[in-house]
Amino acid sequence: EEELQVIQPDKSVLVAAGETATLRCTATSLIPVGPIQWFRGAGPGRELIYNQKEGHFPRVTTVSDLTKRNNMDFSIRIGNITPADAGTYYCVKFRKGSPDDVEFKSGAGTELSVRAKPSAPVVSGPAARATPQHTVSFTCESHGFSPRDITLKWFKNGNELSDFQTNVDPVGESVSYSIHSTAKVVLTREDVHSQVICEVAHVTLQGDPLRGTANLSETIRVPPTLEVTQQPVRAENQVNVTCQVRKFYPQRLQLTWLENGNVSRTETASTVTENKDGTYNWMSWLLVNVSAHRDDVKLTCQVEHDGQPAVSKSHDLKVSAHPKEQGSNTAAENTGSNERNIY
């Protein structure tokens, strides 16, 4: 009788992560008597995948009933495949021996390749905000995909970016891979509503790429422009001075009025108006009692925006033209805070 052969008809099998892999194996004879075992890899470090008589293999089922007397089909199914299962699987026939069974013949092996989808790309921007005209870096990461081939693109508001660097790790063979890309983006004053998108295309995604986004509103700081103007006299001895704070982002802003360098009032921007580009405008006004001043008054509008160093704008108020009112000691009325917005 011809010597037993172990036949693994499939040189390779390709399975998607999460699915079941079928590894086929048949023997050409019932002799010698002894069990079949499945291993991943060869040599002393090989991993036991299935032993028909002993051990716990909850993910493995046999295709046929191995207890049938003349069974020669030793194919197995491995459920819930992950990239870690990739490798070459060997169907090995043992013959009964003492004390241990002895390896008799091995199949040629079946290479199991696992296709695994990349994780949703995660886009992260710089830790600190930056102002228009500055270049900032965004990173995009996606993990756990196989095979290694992958395409990554960057977009800003639908326009493809070209200034980026991408790495796929590891460089050598692995059960799964990760991609890391860094893109450089130049900020403009109009970027409050802008989005940066990282797009990943992979064979497992069937032409429907995965996208990760970052809103530039989290990254940009648009500093305000200030304008201080003197309004027509409201009443005798009173002058209304306004400070227009325009085109700032984010909203966090504190304004201080100074009269001749002395703090008169501090307020926080609350009821702001939003511009079409996502920036904000705000206005504060100060009612100055000119009769309380003998000399000209220097009024300063000082703004601290988003924790940055203060910027200021001054206005010189001439008081010589106004008659002096005796006995008045109030330089400014603190009720002069106005949260209406005037353009």
């Epitope: 470090g45 090989r46 036991l48 008589k53 002993e54 051990g55 191995l66 207890t67 241990d100």
Partner: antibody, heavy 114, light 108 residues
């Protein structure tokens, strides 16, 4: 569900033999080996041997080679472990376990005393 | 035969603490053939970990296994009251199959 039901407690005199049974249900009896493991009072686990229910093939721990016999009855899906020439040190709980090491019998207490 | 030596023999710990149990083999054991069991008084052993590091069905993930060659470890990250028991390592790499002497994890 998988069950391994063992025979009841036994009290034996030194020099006698004891035969413990283990009836399997809920799975294909010939699928995997059946092992016998014992545990003396306050001691650890000790592997005695195994039988292949498909063909009766056995492997014994050399320590028990001369005194243990494992058999099976496929018609009743039952395996047996017989231990002869009993001595006081054989007082233990005897377990049968399926080849997957997940399913164990409830244990059979064998007391050897004169 | 492959002798499995477990240490320590007894581990006295409080609930919430981390337990690290060692199993050393007298000769190399392939990772696929190293199992761990938990046993409570009057009960049969219960399979905890198979193939060195895989959790058996229904075993909480505070249990983990690691190791290779001759050194294997069972770790319980945060002891729960029901974890106080005796733990055994076991090899079925070669005949005769053998068990370690056991480590008793007791309440401090």
């Amino acid at each position: 569900q998988v069950q391994l039901v063992q025979s009841g407690a036994e009290v034996k005199k030194p020099g006698a033999s004891v035969k413990v049974s283990c009836k399997a249900s809920g799975f294909n009896f010939e699928d995997t080996y059946m092992h016998w493991v014992r545990q003396a009072p306050g001691q650890g686990l000790e592997w005695m041997g195994r039988i292949d229910p498909a063909d009766g093939d056995t492997k014994y721990n050399p320590k028990f080679q001369d005194r243990v016999t494992m058999t099976r009855d496929t018609s009743t899906s039952t395996v047996y472990m017989e231990l002869s020439s009993l001595r006081s040190e054989d007082t233990a709980v005897y377990y049968c376990a399926r080849g997957n090491y997940v399913n164990w019998g409830q244990g059979t207490t064998v007391t050897v005393s004169s | 035969e492959i002798v499995l030596t477990q240490s320590p023999g007894t581990l006295s710990l409080s609930p919430g603490e981390r337990a690290t149990l060692s199993c050393r083999a007298s000769s190399s054991v392939s990772s696929s053939y190293l199992y761990w069991y938990q046993q409570k008084p009057g009960q049969a052993p219960r399979l905890l970990i198979y193939s060195t590091s895989n959790l058996a069905s229904g075993i909480p993930d505070r249990f983990s296994g690691s190791g290779s060659g001759t050194d294997f470890t069972l770790t319980i990250s945060r002891l729960e009251p029901e974890d106080f028991a005796v733990y055994y390592c076991h090899q079925w790499y070669s005949y005769p199959r053998t068990f370690g002497g056991g480590t008793k994890v007791e309440i401090k």
